[in-house]
């Protein structure tokens, strides 16, 4: 009933709780002398379903047959309407539509840990939409029984609050769950189990790792477990990996040696436990232990390259470059690099430790045979040294690779191709492709990049440190014993017309011709490799087309003569630059009048 129902009653037949699809009869009847004044025909009883009118009747009672009610609760309210007055609430009723409980499925029980309590879960099946009570029953040896009830609306878990002990691990226990509501009842199939079947050990705790003599090859994992644990499984992985290594161990008694860990690597370790070989379930995984393995001396050898630069008749500058070892080769934090420079005939040697850099520059005499050795050191030792004999890398013209080309290959890649040298191609032991940003003036501080290619390759894709709209000087070296030959080319991964033209800084007269000098276009405005400069000139105040002279681009060139100007005529001159994508805008304009004699 919704309220006190002083004025009348609402009755529901056959029941307030009905099976989905059933019909109900709702009757609203006024109590004596509770209708409208005057006479009963004025009474108008109105039936509401929630807040909407669905039926009416004139008189002392209203009878309504209702079908098709949805699952859940529907509220019906009866009101009385009299002429010239507001409706008066008479009474109401809630009707609960649902279904009988389905048979609970997949009943399973576990006890978490040897000291834990037995708890069971099951699948309720479809929602009954009605108040449904679940009773869980457990029976054991010696006619012992335990019972627990659950009155939750969505009940699918109950904890008995009792602890099974290992005194008789093979004793049978049987659990059963029964669901009851107003429309029926249903019981699960019984689930029978022993102590060993349902006790799920607590996850191992207090996990530690020890490295004997700070060595990765002598590593032991320690942990603590509940007393009855027989089996463990260990899983571990480098912290940056998604794949686990898995190990199963029996009777480990809280320790296990690991033999395949990599040095100087952070690992994550987890352990799980089980009481019996084929009964029961594994514990949850333990909390993770994270630990870094000790360093080992580096393996592998550094990839070393060098550049020679002539200083004067007696001295040359050597710049050495090397690449970092990979993490798996470094096997620790590289503390320094050891560079040894040795004159091979006189035996003089100089050793230097270098930290924080992967390059080294020194000046040596141009005479003598020089060699360098470079190794990387961590706290445990050094890598094997990489030895290189310093030679003139481009001296052997017959070893120079032929038909070198450089083409853009997608975003920020350049494909370099070449043909083997004329000299017996089988003499080539390896190719080295070297590239660096092109800087007029040949700035030696510009980073050098290189890659090595097998002797049977005739192409290499370079992508490391390649930027769009930058021109690179690319060299291909063919190395054979203590000889080398090289060829070079300019290349870019992406280009467009330069953003500005060269700036003419001077025009000088020399024997009837002029010499134009200009400043290079700033690198960031070149927008790729320059192919040509153009010098334009025309008579001042003339509307005629300008004449032009096109000069192939050379890195160091910044002046050019022109000898086709007429004396005592004032000319306007300007310059542009071209890449493969097009021509720049004009540089500055300069006026000039040649003073020489007329022919």
């Amino acid at each position: 009933k919704i309220d006190a129902c002083k004025r009348g009653d609402v009755t529901v037949k056959p029941s307030h709780v009905i099976l989905l699809g059933s019909t109900v009869n709702i009757t609203c009847s006024l109590k004596p002398r509770q209708g409208c004044f005057h006479y009963s025909r004025r009474n108008k009883l109105i039936l509401y379903k929630f807040d909407r009118r669905i039926n009416f009747h004139h008189g002392h009672s209203l009878n309504s047959q209702v079908t098709g009610l949805p699952l859940g609760t529907t509220l019906f309210v009866c009101k009385l309407a009299c002429i010239n007055s507001d409706e008066i609430q008479i009474c109401g009723a809630e009707i609960f539509v649902g279904v009988a409980p389905e048979q609970p499925q997949n009943l399973s029980c576990i006890q978490k840990g040897e000291q834990g309590t037995v708890a069971c879960t099951w699948e309720r099946g479809r929602d009954t939409h009605l108040y449904t009570e679940y009773t869980l029953q457990l029976s054991g040896p010696k006619n012992l029984t335990w019972q627990k009830q659950c009155k939750d609306i969505y009940c699918d878990y109950l904890d008995f609050g009792i602890n099974l002990t290992p005194e008789s691990p093979e004793s049978n226990f049987t659990a059963k769950v029964t669901a009851v509501n107003s429309l029926g009842s249903s019981s699960s199939l019984p689930s029978t189990f022993t102590f060993l079947d349902i006790v799920r050990p607590l996850p191992p705790w207090d996990i530690r790792i020890k490295f004997q003599k700070a060595s990765v090859s002598r590593c032991t994992l320690y942990w603590r477990d509940e007393g009855l644990v027989l089996l463990n499984r260990l899983r571990y992985r480098p912290s940056n990996s998604r794949l686990w290594n898995m190990v199963n161990v029996t009777k480990a008694k809280g320790r296990h040696d690991l033999l395949d860990l990599k040095p100087f690597t952070e690992y994550e370790f987890q352990i799980s436990s089980k009481l019996h070989l084929y009964k029961g379930s594994w514990s949850d995984w333990s909390e993770s232990l994270r630990a870094q393995t000790p360093e080992e001396e580096p393996t592998g050898m550094l990839d070393v390259w060098y550049m020679k630069r002539h200083i004067d008749y007696s001295r040359q500058q050597i710049s050495l470059f090397w690449k970092n070892l990979s993490v798996s080769e470094a096997r620790g934090k590289i503390l320094h690099y050891q560079v040894t420079l040795q004159e091979l005939t006189g035996g003089k040697a100089m050793t230097q430790n270098i930290t924080g850099h992967t390059s080294w520059t020194t000046v040596i005499p141009r005479t003598g045979n020089w060699a360098v050795a470079v190794s990387a050191a961590n706290s445990k030792g050094s890598s094997l040294p990489t030895r290189i004999n310093i030679m003139n890398l481009c001296e052997a013209g017959l070893l120079a690779p032929r038909q070198v080309s450089a083409n853009s290959e997608g975003m920020d890649n350049i494909l370099v191709t070449w043909q083997p040298p004329r000299k017996d191609p089988s003499a080539v032991q390896e190719y080295v492709v070297e590239w660096r940003e092109l800087h007029p003036g040949g700035d030696t501080q510009v980073p050098l990049n290189w890659l090595r290619s097998r002797p049977y390759n005739v192409s290499a894709l370079i992508s490391e440190n390649i930027k769009s709209y930058i021109c690179y000087e690319i060299r291909v070296y063919a190395l054979s014993g203590d000889q080398g030959g090289c060829s070079s080319i300019l290349g870019n991964s992406k280009h467009k017309a330069p953003l500005s033209g060269p700036h003419i800084n001077a025009i000088t007269e020399e024997k009837g011709s002029i010499l134009i000098s200009w400043n290079s276009i700033p690198v960031q405005e070149q927008m790729g490799c320059l192919l040509h400069y153009r010098i334009y000139w025309k008579e001042r105040d003339s509307n005629s087309q300008p004449q032009l002279c096109e000069i192939p681009y050379r890195v160091s060139q910044n002046s050019h003569p022109i000898n086709s100007l007429q004396p005592r005529v004032t000319y306007v001159l300007w310059m542009t630059a071209l890449t493969a994508a097009g021509e720049s805008s004009h540089g500055n304009e300069r006026e000039f009048c040649l003073q020489g004699k007329a022919n």
């Epitope: 669905i54 039926n55 079908t67």
Partner: nanobody, 123 residues
């Protein structure tokens, strides 16, 4: 889904008769009281008549009392309106709808409405 389809409208001379029908589907017709409402050209909605779910109680607007008769056949899921002695002021579109009350303002819900049938009374 809910469907109410009115029929039986048309052009009739003053004093003539028409019988409107409304075929219901998509809901449990016998659960609900039903109504006829009308809308004359350029006017608002006007409640005409109502009948309860089992047909034992009816109500009429004063303007049509004694002239119109509402009835229903739950077996056929059909609502009827018998209109006699028709007058030009009865010209309107007639709608069949789930009963919401006996005043024009009760009909704010449009979820149980038909598309209407036109009745025109003119000499």
């Amino acid at each position: 889904q809910v469907q109410l389809v009115e029929s039986g409208g048309g052009l009739v001379q003053p004093g003539g008769s028409l019988r409107l029908s409304c075929a219901a589907s998509g809901f449990t017709f016998s659960n609900y009281a039903m109504s006829w409402v009308r809308q004359a050209p350029g006017k608002g909605l006007e409640w005409v008549s109502a009948i309860n779910s089992d047909g034992t109680s009816t109500s009429y607007a004063d303007s049509v009392k004694g002239q119109f008769t509402i009835s229903r056949d739950n077996a056929k899921n059909t609502l009827y309106l018998q209109m006699n002695s028709l007058k030009p002021e009865d010209t309107a579109v007639y709608y069949c709808t789930k009963w919401e009350g006996d005043t024009d303002s009760d009909y704010k819900f449009k979820d149980y409405w038909g598309q209407g049938t036109q009745v025109t009374v003119e000499p």
